[in-house]
Interface confidence: low
Amino acid sequence: QETELSVSAELVPTSSWNISSELNKDSYLTLDEPMNNITTSLGQTAELHCKVSGNPPPTIRWFKNDAPVVQEPRRLSFRSTIYGSRLRIRNLDTTDTGYFQCVATNGKEVVSSTGVLF
């Protein structure tokens, strides 16, 4: 279930998912889980998950091979989730393989994680 953005598509605000024990602390930014590598087949669907939390709520950018990911209606999209952000690619093609990186910032700190789609 995607949100297909048309403006500033590389920016996805996220929820402060793990804030329950952090509410009275100063700002923080945490990578909750390293991104998973994906091995899949042509024509299938792949999902990459960027699991981050922070205060203030972080902004997430997606990159493929160091270039911002551009969404394609009904095929390649990403959106905010309750744990960060999810990138979904449908109907995989050989050109979709590569290094995918999510970069999260809360205005003070930056965290990132990289996964490989092959």
């Epitope: 605000p13 402060s16 804030i19 329950s20 509410l23 889980e33 999902e47 998950h49 309750i82 999810r86």
Partner: antibody
Amino acid sequence: QVQLVQSGAEVKKPGSSVKVSCKASGYTLTTNYMHWVRQAPGQGLEWMGWIYPGNGNTKFNHKFDGRVTITADKSTSTAYMELSSLRSEDTAVYYCATSDFDYWGQGTLVTVSS
Amino acid sequence: DIQMTQSPSSLSASVGDRVTITCQASQDIGNNLIWFQQKPGKAPKSLIYFATSLANGVPSRFSGSGSGTDFTLTISSLQPEDFATYYCLQYREYPLTFGPGTKVDIK
């Protein structure tokens, strides 16, 4: 095609425990959260907690005061929710739901009655 | 805990009517809100994510607006299959909390 199939209805005595299962297919359990939500008859929805089966992390609604345990068996792609010290007000339909609440199980009715 | 209130608690409407349901949070939740539809005996179905984003496969007559503490679900032209109960859910802070629901029935 994502499917969450839950175990069947249960009737329990006050003070006992119930364990409800949720088997996932078409869905990678280890890299997604699984939520549990309940709904008393004629009432609204209440979030109970989640598990992240990839590392076993869990988060609970403090309202349940330690009565809820959520586990997962990665080998069978099944999540479990156990509620202990049952009381009559725990009579409800219990649902499992995927990370973003986009897929739900069919629900399991748990009746607590003496 | 963040308290979620919905209004009205129930409403009667006719096919073709424009229906508006509001959800209010007791504190700022940004855009971290989901709207659900539930029919009797069925599991809830997500309609709107992140306050304004339509879920996959949901008809465009449904729309969401708002941020912070005040949110609205609008059905632009009510259809027979839309008679149901609607819930909002905040996922800004633990515990996640649902609104009490708004039942939409036939006038």
